[in-house]
Interface confidence: low
């Protein structure tokens, strides 16, 4: 190889070891019969050399530096050429560095041909190995603007007082043009301006200068976004830090064409604007930092540009002004995306403040709209607390647990609506009465409705889950003795129609000793499966549950237990089951420890099943599953 650099070219070529610290085995640069490990060719020099090995690209790299002096004469503006060209250089990884020095009053603009640039963060690399590293100057200090790959949105970078551009090309890359040009501009009176052009839907991630290090003190940096008028842009901050300011305030400013409040000023902690039509600018302004404890200002953010959906022009009013204890959260449902570009899915408050999750609180009216390609990506969770702690006032009162209509009219699936029901301890209990009788979800007879209710008692320290229930069964009432949560959970899209037919009434009733009482009226067509609360984890120690099972006068009920034995072992106390005929009060008592569970039994009249637990030994909890079937009476035995 021979490299010749004309005088005045202001180009210097260095051939250096990839890792100078590592010993070189059998690979040297051979120049004038000497074996060396470093070679520099300066302007006006010509050097011939070879390598003593067949794979020099593993051992050596090329660094080509060109100084462009705009201080002492006119600047060579226009397209920047790769000199020396690829064909003049040995086949090594090469980095071209252009160092442009200019007066403070002169603006310099780097213009990138398509494909434009995409900024990458620390630890990221470019797929094709081609990277652009761009730095600026503040007096004698170098400031890193960023590292970029191809195929992005960054079209121009404006700076003043000088710019350093490094283009790294892997040895195998065929590129023979720089891909950028330099133009002069008037002073920009800030560190830099980065222009980002979107031609269609897409996203760009951008970072403040020196990221992840600190943004220079009291500096200003601007991003100009060019967005087609028919698309919408949303800004979200992925990562930021604020420094300790002595004077002024760190902030971001938006210039949004058509806005009457330009510039719109936000703190970095604020929710950033979304749903912006057309072009806009974003500026980051630093402050005078505390000399003792400066901290660092840094920002990494994403701009997402996408088509407005039909919904983005529709505003929904959610009126929680009459509510005291309700909160509604709209959030992404947990799904994995296979697509490369995933459009954002935002909920917008007052059409401008958009974010992926929004919680609407009680006491206000909320105007919301959506900026989302597919609203099925979102769901809603609602919590409402009903506090009935004054037992004299609330005794005998009833409430309907119904989902408010303006929540059902939202175009987002309701996932959970949870009512937290608080009652005074040992004073009042709760009775849940469904409009349509309920079925308990079991493995043997799972629910397949579009929604169901999950009922649990929520006393701290006690984990008691009564079960999951859905319309279309035999359970007429559920009585719960203490604070409870009832969660309506939806399973299928058509639930709105079904849920509007279903009312669940909660009444405050006198306190009772059992954890729960289920009132069951079996229907003659189906087996009724019932299982004890806290299934799989065991009924809590020393608690009891009852089932009040009605038997129509022309039917006989058969009560069958799923297992032969309960599997329970008591540490202390006794565990037993009472089956009591309601008409005659005749009762049978079974120990749930030693004895075999009762064989199938026939009941001609309504009866109670009550189970009372002991303090079980670990691993020997009480879980019972039984079923009731009805058959017509053949002979009246009364």
């Amino acid at each position: 190889s021979e490299i010749a650099l004309p005088r005045g070219s202001d180009i210097t070529v260095h051939i250096k070891l990839v890792s100078p610290a590592l010993p070189v085995k059998f690979c040297y640069i051979v120049v004038s019969r000497q074996h060396v490990t470093e070679l520099t060719i300066r302007p006006g020099e010509r050097k011939s050399f070879t390598f003593s090995c067949n794979n020099p690209e593993k051992h050596y790299v090329l660094k080509i530096e060109k100084n462009i002096d705009c201080m002492s004469g006119p600047c060579p503006f226009g397209e920047v050429r790769l000199q020396p060209s690829k064909s003049e250089l040995p086949i090594l990884n090469r980095t071209y560095i252009w160092d442009v020095r200019a007066h403070k009053s002169i603006g310099l603009e780097l213009q990138f041909a398509t494909p434009r640039l995409r900024q990458i963060g620390p630890g990221e690399s470019c797929a094709d190995g081609v990277t652009h590293s761009i730095s600026g100057h503040i007096d004698a200090t170098e400031v890193r603007i960023g590292t970029f790959c191809s195929n992005g949105t960054v079209s121009r970078i404006k700076m003043q007082e000088g710019v350093k551009m490094a283009l790294h090309l892997p040895w195998f890359h065929p590129r023979n043009i720089s891909g950028f040009s330099i133009a002069n501009r008037s002073s920009i009176k800030r560190l830099c301006i980065i222009e980002s052009v979107f031609e269609g839907e897409g996203s760009a991630t951008l970072m403040s200068a020196n990221y992840p290090g600190g943004f220079p003190e009291d500096e200003l940096m601007t991003w100009q976004f060019v967005v087609p008028a028919h698309l919408r842009a949303s800004v979200s901050f992925l990562n930021f830090n604020v420094s300790n300011c002595e004077r002024k305030e760190e902030r971001v400013e938006y210039y949004i064409p058509g806005s009457t409040t330009n510039p719109e000023v936000f703190r970095l902690e604020d929710q950033q604007p979304g749903n912006m039509a057309g072009n806009f600018n974003l500026s980051l302004q630093g402050c005078d930092q505390d000399a003792q404890s400066p901290g660092i200002l840094r920002l990494q953010f994403q701009v997402l540009v996408q088509r407005p959906q039909n919904e983005s022009n529709i505003t929904y009013m959610v009126d929680l002004s009459q509510e005291r204890t309700m909160s509604l959260t709209i959030e992404p449902r947990p799904v994995k995306h296979g697509r490369r570009f995933v459009p954002g899915c935002f909920v917008c408050l007052d059409s401008r403040t958009c974010s992926t999750n929004v919680t609407l609180t009680a006491g206000s009216k909320h105007k919301i709209s959506f900026l989302c390609d597919d609203l099925a990506r979102l769901w809603m969770n609602v919590e409402k607390t009903l506090s009935c702690l004054d037992h004299r006032y609330y005794y005998g009162k009833s409430f309907n647990l119904q989902v408010p209509k303006d929540i059902l009219q939202l175009p987002v699936q309701l996932h959970d609506f949870s009512w937290k029901l608080l009652v005074p301890k040992d004073r009042l209990g709760l009775m849940l009465v469904p409009g349509q009788k309920l079925q308990q979800h079991t493995r043997e007879r799972p629910c397949n409705t579009s929604f169901g209710y999950q009922v649990a008692s929520t006393t701290p320290g006690q984990d008691l889950y009564f079960g999951s229930f859905c319309p279309g069964g035999s359970i007429e009432k559920i009585q719960v003795k203490q604070n409870s949560s009832v969660t309506l959970r939806t399973y299928a899209p058509g639930f709105q129609q079904e849920v509007s037919k279903q009312v669940l009434t909660v009444s405050l009733i006198p306190y009772f000793k059992e954890e729960g009482i289920f009132t069951v009226t079996p229907d003659s067509k189906n087996k009724v499966y019932l299982r004890s609360p806290n299934w799989d984890r065991g009924l809590p120690a020393l608690s009891s549950v009852s089932w009040n099972i009605s038997v129509p006068s022309n039917q006989v009920a058969c009560l069958t237990f799923f297992r032969e034995r309960s599997g329970l072992a008591c540490q202390s106390g006794r565990a037993f089951m009472i089956i009591q005929e309601q008409q005659t009060r005749a009762e049978e008592i079974f120990s749930l420890e030693e004895e075999v569970l009762p064989k199938p039994s026939f009941h001609h009249h309504s009866f109670w099943v009550n189970i009372s637990n002991c303090s079980p030994m670990n691993g020997k909890q009480l879980d019972l599953l039984f079923w009731v079937t009805l058959t017509p009476r053949t002979v009246d035995l009364t």
Epitope: E331, P332, R333, P334, N381, D416, S418, Q454, A456, T458, P460, G461, D463, Y465, S485, T487, D536, R537, G538, G567, M617, N618, G619, Q621, D623
Partner: antibody
Framework: EVKLVESGPGLVKPSQSLSLTCTVT?????????WNWIRQFPGNKLEWMGY???????SYNPSLKSRISVTRDTSKNQFFLQLKSVTIEDTATYFC?????????????WGQGTTVTVSS | EIVLTQSPLSLPVSLGDQASISCRSR???????????LDWYLQKPGQSPKLLIY???IRFSGVPDRFSGSRSGTDFTLKISRVEAEDLGIYYC?????????FGGGTKLEIK
Amino acid sequence: EVKLVESGPGLVKPSQSLSLTCTVTGYSITSDYAWNWIRQFPGNKLEWMGYISYNTYTSYNPSLKSRISVTRDTSKNQFFLQLKSVTIEDTATYFCAGGDYYGTGAVDYWGQGTTVTVSS
Amino acid sequence: EIVLTQSPLSLPVSLGDQASISCRSRQTLVHTNGNTYLDWYLQKPGQSPKLLIYKVSIRFSGVPDRFSGSRSGTDFTLKISRVEAEDLGIYYCFQGSHVPWTFGGGTKLEIK
């Protein structure tokens, strides 16, 4: 990627309450999982303290009796530990962890832990 | 509460050796739903524990196949077929079948 980060005071005085926060990113605490607190005493002994499940059930280690409470704030995707009336025996590294209650049944995701010293 | 007894307390091995750690329970760890929630975790110095094996013998995703778990009654064993340097640390067994969930005392795997 699911990430859990514990935060809270590193020093608590005896008889005061210890309050820790676990911030979960990459997964909604209302979607699934039991969200646990586990501590490791000097000498490496590990103790499970309790959890709040995605659907708000709680379960606690009986040895902590009425001192412990695990709560959550779904809007911030955080869950919390409160331990009342601490003594020097509560000096430990406290981990928050996500347990796949129904799948693996194990504690799949752990925070890095935060050291709490109880001392006057 | 269920006490899990791990042995040995310390296990010096040479790289490439097989290692075997035992975890014993006096009571059954079979949950009423039929599952046995016995897990193994590895804690490296300065790190949080990481799940290796769950439900006695199922490897967690990303765990090399040199790790295996087995059981005989209420005795559980973790085996490492060929110890590598990255396997060093403290191994804990953990039962999640019965509240309170409990950990074993730990076994330190170290180089001979």
